[in-house]
Each structure stands twice: as C-alpha cells, then as structure tokens.
C-alpha cells in the first residue's frame, strides 16, 4: 500500500481552519490479522529523509492524535484533548484520513506528516508516510481563504473529486 498526499502545500490566512488530508492507496488487506494505525505529527525536511523526526502538533504528540482500526474503516479521535487544542483527526471509508486545525496562527506554519502503520499481527509492522507544507500568512498579502496546491504525483481527477475535503 501507499500513502498519497493530494496537496503538497496549503497556504492559509491567520484565524482560518484547514483540513490536511492523506489517502491510503493500493491493496489494503482487510483480514483479521491486519490493522492500521494512522496518526499525524510535525517534522522537518531532513537531509536524509523527510518526516523522520516526530514533533508535536500544538503540544499534542502523535500518540494523542492517532486513529486505530482495520483497513478502510471510519474513525475519529474520541477524546476531548485534541479538540481543546483545536485539532481533530478523522478517517473515512475510502482511505482518506485527515487532521483539522482550527483558528490557525503563524506558529502553525511548517511541515506536517501523516503516518500509516500496517500491523501484521505476530509478524511485522510496515510504515508509510506523507508530507505536506502549511504556510499561515497574515497581512495584506494573505489569501482570504486557504489555497491548496496539488502534489505533482497526484492525478488531476483526484484533486477535483476530493476538492471539497480541503477548502474550509
């Protein structure tokens, strides 16, 4: 399986909400011995590998933001901790999973990573991640709403089909 990032760059005005999205692609084993753990964290563009470093999002760790279920099942963060920080992660039946950040500030600018861990019980774990940049702007040059820029590897039909997921 792979993780696709429909948008590689989100440019948003301060105070706006944004939903960053990743999509699970490829064959997904739906057997009882496989589950998927999905989460989000901030990182930096490392020289060797992007997303290798895990930093908190608004003081919440990837452990606090995770989703855990089998295959293409819907889920969302169940506790109030994330929502108190203006965050919510969610997943749908189509392999899309997202994190919504409310009331953006300049401090939210940076690199965000989604992580999927495929857990094959009693055997192994396989990790895949996706990366996207969030730029929060203020002043006269800031857009009035979030502007999203497609990833070069993403097909245009997917961008159009899922456009509504990313304008908030």
């Amino acid at each position: 399986f792979k993780v696709a990032t429909p948008y590689s760059l989100y440019v948003c005005p301060e105070g706006q909400n944004v939903t960053l999205t990743c999509r699970l692609l490829g064959p997904v084993d739906k057997g009882h011995d496989v589950t998927f753990y999905k989460t989000w964290y901030r990182s930096s563009r490392g020289e060797v590998q992007t997303c290798s470093e895990r930093r908190p999002i608004r003081n919440l760790t990837f452990q606090d933001l995770h989703l855990h279920h089998g295959g293409h099942q819907a889920a969302n963060t169940s506790h109030d901790l994330a929502q108190r920080h203006g965050l919510e992660s969610a997943s749908d039946h189509h392999g899309n999973f997202s994190i919504t950040m409310r009331n953006l500030t300049l401090l939210d600018s940076g690199l965000y990573c989604c992580l999927v861990v495929e857990i094959r019980h009693h055997h192994s774990e396989h990790r895949v991640h996706g990366a996207m940049e969030l730029q929060v702007q203020t002043g006269k040059d800031a857009p009035s709403n979030c502007v999203v820029y497609p990833s070069s590897s993403q097909e245009s039909e997917n961008i159009t089909a899922h456009h509504h997921h990313h304008h908030h």
């Epitope: 589950t35 990837f62 452990q63 901790l81 857990i119 009693h122 774990e125």
Partner: antibody, heavy 118, light 107 residues
C-alpha cells in the same frame, strides 16, 4: 503528561501466582498501546507482553506464553499482568511502558520487583 | 527472533572522551531501531529512535547512525551523567528484542 506506576510485586514460591498492576495518570491512557518489560537482577531487558489500546490484539514472549496474561481496564486507567506457574527465572523487576505501533518504549514506570524463591 | 548483539560489553572511558557503541542485528531491521540509557535503580530512557533521531530532550552530544544490520551510538564528549548502561532495541518484528547492553564506566 502521563505517568506510570507499577505495583503488586513481592516474594512468591515457585508455581505460585501474582498479579501486577500499572496505574496511569492522564486522560489518554485508553489511546495507548502498552507493554510489560522485565529485567532480571544484573541482567538486560526482556520484552514480555504487549496489548493494544482496545485490548486486542495481544502478544507474548515465548518464555511466558501460556503462563502470563496481559489485560487492561481503560475505565480505571490500569494495565495488568497475571502471572501463573511462576519460576525462579521469572525473578525480575517488571516495568510497564507505553508502546505505540511504529514507535518505541518512550514512557516507563519505575518498576516493581518480583522474586520467585522457595 | 531477531538477535541484537552489542559491543563492547564494557567501555572504560574518562569524561570528555568520545564513546562509540555498536549494535548488530541477526537480520535486517531496516531503520526500526532505538537506543536507551539506563542508570542504576532507574527505568530505561529512550535516547534515539528510528536509528538516528534524538528523542525529546536528549542532548546533541548523542548521535546515532546505521540501517539494516549495523548500528552505532556515539557520545561525542562524555559528561559525568552519561556513565550508564546502553541498550539497543528493534521493533521490525515480534518479539521485540533488546541487545544485552553496553556499560559505559568511568576509567
């Protein structure tokens, strides 16, 4: 910040039983995978068992399979290890630790000592 | 089961010296390897994750590298508080396994 505190250790005879507990502070315990790890006196670390946030799946080291049972009560923010048919080689400090998929043991309790001796 | 072999078993050094610890896996663990520090009477502490990333709050004098089967932890200049036992651990497969440890002692 979550803190972990183990209890329930003590002296037990070979063949006996003991139940260890790990109490977690913090509201997000139910989100975490948890493990038990032990360390025999003067020896290295040995992973014993792991339980997912929901209570299933569960994993055991071969050395304890069939004798130890891991469980959790998310409503009580507690992790347990039921140890039966104890042997001298089970003597160790037992630690509970947070253990997320694709991650490592980043949060540990201070441990509780289990001594199996006649 | 993946066996992790650490060397040397003991490293005798003076404060300010450089320490180089090795961990070798019996089969590839990709970059899914961590290093821990343990002081007497204390629980282990995560130092390094995914072979080369420092955990939160770990000083820059700790660095690590490697992938596959060969991994190295380096302490560039030993501080008095660095004298401890260091363990590597893999999570590429079940069961989770640790190396037997390297003790860094004061010379």
């Amino acid at each position: 910040q979550v803190q972990l505190v183990e209890s329930g250790g003590g002296l037990v005879k070979p063949g006996g039983s003991l139940r260890l507990s790990c109490a977690a502070s913090g509201e997000t315990f139910s989100d975490y995978y948890m493990s038990w790890i032990r360390q025999a006196p003067g020896k290295g670390l040995e992973w014993v068992s792991e339980i997912s946030n929901s209570g299933s799946p569960i994993y055991y080291a071969d050395s304890v399979k069939g004798r130890f049972t891991i469980s959790r009560d998310n409503a009580k923010n507690s992790l347990y290890l039921q140890m039966n048919s104890l042997r001298a080689e089970d003597t160790a400090v037992y630690y509970c630790a947070r253990d997320e998929p694709g991650w490592y043991f980043d949060l540990w309790g201070r441990g509780t000592l289990v001594t199996v001796s006649s | 089961e993946i066996v992790l072999t650490q060397s040397p078993a003991t490293l005798s050094l003076s404060p300010g010296e450089r320490a180089t610890l090795s961990c070798r896996a019996s089969q590839s663990v990709s970059s899914y390897l961590a290093w821990y520090q343990q002081k007497p009477g204390q629980a282990p502490r995560l130092l390094i994750y995914d072979a080369s990333n420092r955990a939160t709050g770990i000083p820059a004098r700790f660095s690590a590298s490697g992938s596959g089967t060969d991994f190295t932890l380096t302490i560039s200049s030993l501080e008095p508080e660095d004298f401890a036992v260091y363990y590597c651990q893999q999570r590429n497969n079940w069961p989770r396994t640790f190396g037997q440890g390297t003790k860094v002692e004061i010379k």
